[in-house]
C-alpha cells in the first residue's frame, strides 16, 4: 500500500508512517515502528506538558518568585504550568503574571477614574475634549484645559489630551 | 535600582505626632511620583498619601485627610509624611513607594504604633 501523507488526529507522520502522539503529561521517549507502538513517558515531578505531543522534553513549571512578589495560585500538574499570582495588595504587571506592582500608572492623555484598592488595580480613563493629563499617574484625574477667555487672555495653541491649551495677548491692532 | 529607606516611626500617644521620612539610594526621586502606604496588623495594605513628582498635586485617603501631610525635597532625594492627630487606627507599618512601584523596589517600612 501507498505510504500515508497525512495521519489522523493524535497521530504524527515519521518514516513514513504514522505514530500515536503522546497525552499531555507525557514525553516522548521512542517513535513508533512497523512493529512497535511509541514510547512515552510521563514528565517528572517539576514539569508538564498541555498538549497530545512529540516532544523529547517536558517543559518546567513555572516559578512564583517571591522576591518578585510572587506566589503560587495554583500548583502545577504534569499536564498544567504552575499559575502564578501577586501577594495580597499587589497586581500583575501581564496576563502571565511574571511580575508584581502596587497600582499601575495612567499614561499621558489618561486620567485616574478609581485609585488603587487592595483588590483592584488603577483604573484609567482617556481624557476628554477640554481635558488634559500630560503626567503618568496613579492618582491624578485629567485637568481641565485652561480658560483663556476668564484672563483676558485669547488660545494661541489647542490643546490636546496630553498638553493644555497655551494662552496670549490678545491682538489688540485696530484698522 | 532605586533603595528606599522609611523611618520616623515610634511609640506615639493618641493625639501626637510623627513625621515619617523616605530616603532613597542608588536612584533618584525628583520628577516622580509617591506613595506613603501602610499595612495594619492582619490587614491589607491601605494607600495613604501621595505627591506628584512636581510636587504640586497630592492625594490623602479619607481617613488621613486634615491630619497628615506629604511633601518632597528632591535636593535631599527624601520623602516626608508629617502625621498629627494620631488614633490608635494609624497603627501600621509605613511603606513609601516610587513610580513603577515595582515589588523589588519596596523598603523594609517603618513601625508606628499610637497607645496610650
Known amino acids: 500500500p501507498e505510504p500515508p501523507t497525512a495521519c489522523r488526529e493524535k497521530q504524527y507522520l515519521i518514516n513514513s508512517q504514522c505514530c500515536s502522539l503522546c497525552q499531555p503529561g507525557q514525553k516522548l521517549v521512542s517513535d513508533c515502528t512497523e512493529f512497535t507502538e511509541t514510547e512515552c513517558l510521563p514528565c517528572g515531578e517539576s514539569e508538564f506538558l498541555d498538549t497530545w505531543n512529540r516532544e523529547t522534553h517536558c517543559h518546567q513549571h513555572k516559578y512564583c518568585d517571591p522576591n518578585l512578589g510572587l506566589r503560587v495560585q495554583q500548583k502545577g500538574t504534569s499536564e498544567t504550568d504552575t499559575i502564578c499570582t501577586c501577594e495580597e495588595g499587589w497586581h500583575c504587571t501581564s496576563e502571565a503574571c511574571e511580575s508584581c506592582v502596587l497600582h499601575r500608572s495612567c499614561s499621558p492623555g489618561f486620567g485616574v477614574k478609581q485609585i488603587a484598592t487592595g483588590v483592584s488595580d488603577t483604573i484609567c480613563e482617556p481624557c476628554p475634549v477640554g481635558f488634559f493629563s500630560n503626567v503618568s499617574s496613579a492618582f491624578e484625574k485629567c485637568h481641565p484645559w485652561t480658560s483663556c477667555e476668564t484672563k483676558d487672555l485669547v488660545v494661541q495653541q489647542a490643546g490636546t489630551n496630553k498638553t493644555d491649551v497655551v494662552c496670549g495677548p490678545q491682538d489688540r491692532l485696530r484698522a | 535600582e532605586v533603595q528606599l529607606l522609611e523611618s520616623g516611626g515610634g511609640l506615639v500617644q493618641p493625639g501626637g505626632s510623627l513625621r515619617l521620612s523616605c530616603a532613597a539610594s542608588?536612584?533618584?526621586?525628583?520628577?516622580?511620583e509617591m506613595w506613603w502606604v501602610r499595612q495594619a496588623p492582619g490587614k491589607g495594605l491601605e494607600r495613604v498619601s501621595a505627591i506628584s513628582g512636581s510636587g504640586g498635586s497630592t492625594y490623602y485617603a479619607d481617613s488621613v485627610k486634615g491630619r497628615f501631610t506629604i511633601s518632597r525635597d528632591d535636593s535631599k532625594n527624601t520623602l516626608y509624611l508629617q502625621m498629627n492627630s494620631l488614633r490608635a487606627e494609624d497603627t501600621a507599618v509605613y511603606y513609601c513607594a516610587r513610580d513603577p512601584y515595582s515589588f523589588d523596589y519596596w523598603g523594609q517600612g517603618t513601625l508606628v504604633t499610637v497607645s496610650s
Open positions: 542608588g536612584s533618584t526621586i525628583a520628577g516622580y
